[in-house]
């Protein structure tokens, strides 16, 4: 399956939207920095069959969608930017789902690496727990926004490697 060029553009637009979402100066939030334990190895893409890599990307985008769809998120971020953000994430989820369907029967390996999916879910659970502990403060959201932007940048690298694998 070829991930369409529109998918790559959508990923870039997502990063641009997230960059615009900032409400307060991150300089004032240094003390709230936190190690969420980003699962780097799940995005290295070396040990995966293509379908498994796609399922990990899908999980990350789905979890991001869930994270930013809460009422606490809606109360924090600009509504217009959030709507644009949802649209881009939805586009990416559709692209990845279409790709996953095409991969059915192409490879002998399972479509999903369950351990990898669980690792991504636990990563997002840590982010949610952090927000809860910080009472969804503006700085906590700034830290999370920075973390998700980094995650998207790293996942873009995995997508690029997948594209080169064609």
């Amino acid at each position: 399956c070829d991930l369409p060029q529109t998918h790559s553009l959508s990923n870039r637009r997502t990063l641009m939207i997230m960059a615009q979402m900032g409400r307060i100066s991150p300089f004032s939030c240094l003390k709230d920095r936190h190690d969420f334990g980003f699962p780097q190895e799940e995005f290295d893409g070396n040990q995966f069959q293509k379908a498994q890599a796609i399922s990990v990307l899908h999980e990350m985008i789905q979890q991001t969608f869930n994270l930013f769809s809460t009422k606490d998120s809606s109360a924090t971020w600009d509504e217009t930017l959030l709507d644009k953000f949802y649209t881009e994430l939805y586009q990416q989820l559709n692209d990845l789902e279409a790709c996953m369907m095409q991969e059915v029967g192409v490879e002998d390996t399972p479509l999903m690496n369950v351990d990898s999916i669980l690792t991504v879910r636990k990563y997002f659970q840590r982010i949610t727990l952090y927000l809860t502990e910080k009472k969804y403060s503006p700085c906590a959201w700034e830290v999370v926004r920075a973390e998700i932007m980094r995650s998207f940048s790293l996942s873009a690298n995995l997508q690029e490697r997948l594209r080169r694998k064609e």
Partner: antibody, heavy 121, light 107 residues
């Protein structure tokens, strides 16, 4: 390979203006902040200020506020440190270094090679 | 501003010695502390971040510990290339501030 390359040594007279640069490569320039550090001859490190190149938001140490200006041009992945009127006491080595912002990653993990500024009449 | 005080300001040691440098912050900085090494004519080099995390490529003889206001950099067995000046730096709040430095010299 991540690199921060600074402009060359400068010899200036008191009262002159100066702008030195720090060009980043091998990474996403807007994903990291750029900090500036002064080291006067035979002395320790002094933190001057920092810029977020994504939106040019800047903060200065009180000691350097109003004395220098930090700026960035993200289109060419370059940060700047400038003086409008140099003093002999500005004679020092100036370093730039990158900072991961709010991400959990090593602080100031890459440094420029330094720019030696000499101010003498 | 948060003040950072290092001790000693200089020390003499031999190759193979265990060396300890301390850094004290004027208020709690949690674990937001970095350690740098600087050799004459060179840019500083990050050794330890977040009080105890070893920066990639740094030999394991370097270690950091502490939290709150008191921190320590330890070199378990001093090597010839370790003779340099070491700086601590708080990273919890702007303006970031450095300690005055500790010069490690050959005995």
């Amino acid at each position: 390979e991540v690199q921060l390359v600074q402009s060359g040594a400068e010899v200036k007279k008191p009262g002159e203006s100066l702008k030195i640069s720090c060009k980043g490569s091998g990474y996403s320039f807007t994903s990291y902040w750029i900090g500036w550090v002064r080291q006067m001859p035979g002395k320790g490190l002094e933190w001057m200020g920092i810029i977020d190149p994504s939106d040019s938001d800047t903060r200065y140490s009180p000691s350097f506020q109003g004395q220098v200006t930090i700026s960035a041009d993200k289109s060419i992945s370059t940060a700047y440190l400038q003086w409008s009127s140099l003093k002999a006491s500005d004679t020092a080595m100036y370093y730039c270094a990158r900072h991961p912002g709010l991400n959990w990653a090593p602080d100031f993990d890459y440094w420029g090679q330094g720019t030696l500024v000499t101010v003498s009449s | 501003d948060i003040q950072m005080t290092q001790s000693p300001s200089s020390l003499s040691a031999s190759v193979g010695d265990r060396v300890t440098i301390t850094c004290r912050a004027s208020q709690s900085i949690n674990r937001f502390l970095n350690w740098y090494q600087q050799k004459p004519g060179k840019a500083p080099k990050l050794l330890i971040y977040a009080a105890s995390s070893l920066q990639s490529g740094v030999p394991s003889r370097f270690s950091g510990s502490g939290s709150g206001t008191d921190f320590t950099l330890t070199i378990s067995s001093l090597q010839p290339e370790d003779f340099a000046t070491y700086y601590c730096q708080q990273a919890i709040d702007l303006p970031f501030t450095f300690g005055q430095g500790t010069k490690v010299e050959i005995k």
